[in-house]
């Protein structure tokens, strides 16, 4: 039985075209800022807004930088190391149940409550009983929704999981 | 969903050839390896070879080299290996793998493996 070969010993019989601004890898890996070339010997930056890399990682690819939807705010762009930072609009909220998605926050509290929250990109506002002070969990109203994406979510090219 | 499927798998006299298939589906990713491993009873998972899609780079074991050719088809999304001058310790379980990392000679680099196809010299 022959051991596995690492890349050391590998020479490849094909190098892949010149892409962009190239480095060596340490130990195998790129730095945040880039992916490694099909042969192992380079570093190949990501391109600036248009994808990017987080980690030290040896991936033929960088992952792509998403794209604030309509009903978003960007909060910071992509760059080659950070994703887009994308925030909901003033007036929406983001629900942990549902990420992908800006809802309206509502307007008021039921009958017989109070308001003690405000409507933030992450939160509904918050309403407690008037005597007992117990949270209320509603539903919220129907209203038209925005499909948009999570915050920092990597928009990636497909799932790895297939 | 990715999905590898081997074939061209059969019993061949000693000094012989054969030729493997592994079609894949599913794939989207902007550039992958696709590998070839086999596995003989009681033994480790081998690397084989692998070849890039973009570039095209290719990689063998030493193993093998000289005597095993990858080569792909890009329009139908499939690896070959082609075996000649087999010998009976070739006999073993050939699998096909995808990756998404450089220089993936190793077992745990790839993602997504096939069934395997039987090859008994």
């Known amino acids: 039985e022959s051991a596995l070969i690492t890349q050391q010993d590998l020479a490849p019989q094909q190098r892949a075209a010149p892409q962009q601004k190239r480095s060596s890898p340490s130990e195998g890996l790129c730095p945040p800022g880039h992916h490694i070339s099909e042969d192992g010997r380079d570093c190949i930056s990501c391109k600036y807004g248009q994808d990017y890399s987080t980690h030290w990682n040896d991936l033929l690819f960088c992952l792509r930088c998403t794209r604030c939807d309509s009903g978003e705010v960007e909060l910071s762009p992509c760059t080659t190391t950070r994703n887009t930072v994308c925030q909901c609009e003033e007036g929406t909220f983001r629900e942990e149940d549902s990420p992908e998605m800006c809802r309206k926050c509502r307007t008021g509290c039921p009958r017989g409550m109070v308001k003690v929250g405000d409507c933030t990109p992450w939160s509904d506002i918050e309403c407690v009983h008037k005597e007992s002070g117990t949270k209320h969990s509603g539903e919220v109203p129907a209203v038209e929704e925005t499909v948009t994406s999570s915050p920092g979510t990597p928009a990636s090219p497909c799932s790895l999981s297939g | 969903e990715v999905q590898l499927l081997e074939s061209g798998g059969g019993e061949v006299q000693p000094g012989g050839s054969l030729r493997l298939s592994c079609a894949a589906s599913g794939l989207t990713f902007p550039n992958y390896g696709m590998g070839w491993f086999r596995q003989a009873p009681g033994k480790e998972r081998e690397f084989l070879a692998v070849i890039y899609w973009s570039g095209g780079t290719v990689y063998y074991a030493e193993s093998v080299k000289g005597r095993f050719t990858i080569s792909r088809d890009n329009a139908k999304n499939t690896v070959y290996l082609q075996m000649s001058s087999l010998r009976a310790e070739d006999t073993a379980v050939y699998y096909c793998?995808?990756?998404?990392?450089?220089?993936?000679?190793?077992?745990?680099?790839?993602?997504?493996w096939g069934q395997g196809t039987l090859v008994t010299v």
């Open positions: 793998a995808v990756t998404i990392r450089g220089a993936a000679t190793q077992t745990w680099k790839y993602d997504y």
